[in-house]
């Protein structure tokens, strides 16, 4: 299973649920579905309040039980380490795959943290991060921001991923804007 890691804003906007959590248990395999579940302890929720309704405490995250079908394998054994998890809700359960955005909270830049807590949501409605995978790239709409990180040092470590968000400048126009300048 291979996929290009998304821009964090894309991960935020395309997810039903975005939380901060610790992985606290050994994974278990459910025999009925052949999904594995990880026990988590949620510390913050950034997106999904309406989708979850009253059941706002997520205790498990589910993923396919095999790598070849995009199952997520959690490699850290540090149960006190917090992770940003962006996933989909299926039948009220949080699902992630290899392609989901799952990252140690401490590995995120201050700008990315700001994005997840406040700013990315502003760009979800109108704006689209448009990946440029090979040159030449053309903007297909004024609401697209051209994401060129992959052409340089790798998508997650690039400047646009770590410091910028695609936000509305005026109706019908979105541009890259610095998240650093918005940090108090």
């Amino acid at each position: 299973c291979t996929c290009v890691p998304p821009h964090p804003q894309t991960a935020f906007c395309n997810s039903d649920l975005v939380i901060r959590a610790k992985f606290v248990g050994t994974p278990e395999v459910n025999q009925t579905t052949l999904y594995q579940r990880y026990e988590i302890k949620m510390t913050k929720m950034y997106k999904g309040f309406q989708a979850l309704g009253d059941a706002a405490d997520i205790r498990f995250v589910y993923t396919p039980a095999m790598e070849s079908v995009c199952g997520y394998f959690h490699r850290s054994h540090n149960r006190s380490e917090e992770f940003l998890i962006a996933g989909k809700l299926q039948d009220g359960l949080l699902h992630i795959t290899t392609c989901s955005f799952v990252a140690p909270w401490n590995s995120l830049s201050l700008a990315q943290r700001r994005g997840f807590t406040k700013t990315y949501t502003v760009g979800c409605e109108e704006c689209t991060v448009f990946p440029c995978l090979s040159i030449p790239c053309k903007l297909q709409s004024g609401t697209h921001c051209l994401w060129t990180d992959q052409l340089l040092q790798g998508s997650e470590k690039g400047f646009q991923s770590r410091h910028l968000a695609c936000l509305p400048r005026e109706p019908g126009l979105c541009t890259w804007q610095s998240l650093r300048s918005q940090i108090a």
């Epitope: 994974p27 395999v29 025999q31 579905t33 070849s68």
Partner: antibody, heavy 113, light 111 residues
């Protein structure tokens, strides 16, 4: 008590097909993932395939992917393994197993011309 | 393609204790608590002796015990008896290949 009984083994020519069945009793069949495991003569155990309890997910060993198909009929408490494009190296005793615990007695599949 | 490493053979005298090791990786033995041990007598189906690392199914003698440390699981048989002579296989859930087995260990009871 819990029981698994395999059937359908036999002699088949290379390139041929065979369908194995496994009749289950003594447990709630649709609550358990089921596997096929094989053992070539004088060799160790090799996992072949698994199917989830509800039949929605199936996984295969690389050695059989694209040739074998696992399926189940929960209304009949029966597990199946459809084996196509059989090769000499598929010769083995095939065991039906409840995920990680109960095994059947096995059925011998011989692929030879 | 053997994924888990077991010694090819071990031996012991009646009454002794023996231990069979099973070494894997963090994606199988080390990452999950799904390690099983099977006993297989010639011409018979494998019989589950230990599941979930250290649990014994009902009907299995308490002379059989299992444990795990890191990426290595172990089966210990105490008070060895003649009927313990058999092949022993470890098995683990594996994230990459779903299910993997060791190559098997032939246990010989001397005398």
């Amino acid at each position: 008590q819990v029981q698994l009984v395999e059937s359908g083994g036999g002699l088949v020519q290379p390139g041929g097909s065979l369908r194995l069945s496994c009749a289950a009793s003594g447990f709630t069949f649709n609550s358990y993932a089921m596997s096929w495991v094989r053992q070539a003569p004088g060799k160790g155990l090799e996992w072949v395939s698994v199917i989830s309890g509800n039949g929605s997910n199936t996984y295969y060993a690389d050695s059989v992917k694209g040739r074998f198909t696992i399926s189940r009929d929960n209304s009949k408490n029966t597990l199946y393994l459809q084996m196509n494009s059989l090769r000499a190296e598929d010769t083995a005793v095939y065991y039906c197993a409840r995920f990680l615990d109960i095994w059947g007695q096995g059925t011998l599949v011989t692929v030879s011309s | 393609d053997i994924a888990l490493t077991q010694p090819a053979s071990v031996s012991g005298s009646p009454g002794q204790s023996i231990t069979i090791s099973c070494t894997g990786t963090s994606s199988d033995v080390g990452g999950y608590n799904y390690v099983s041990w099977y006993q297989q007598h010639p011409g018979k189906a494998p019989k589950l002796m230990i599941y979930d690392v250290s649990n014994r199914p009902s009907g299995v003698s308490n002379r059989f015990s299992g444990s795990k440390s890191g990426n290595t699981a172990s089966l210990t048989i105490s008070g060895l008896q003649a009927e313990d002579e058999a092949d022993y296989y470890c098995q683990s859930y594996d994230f990459i290949r779903f299910m993997v087995f060791g190559g098997g260990t032939k246990l010989t009871v001397l005398g």
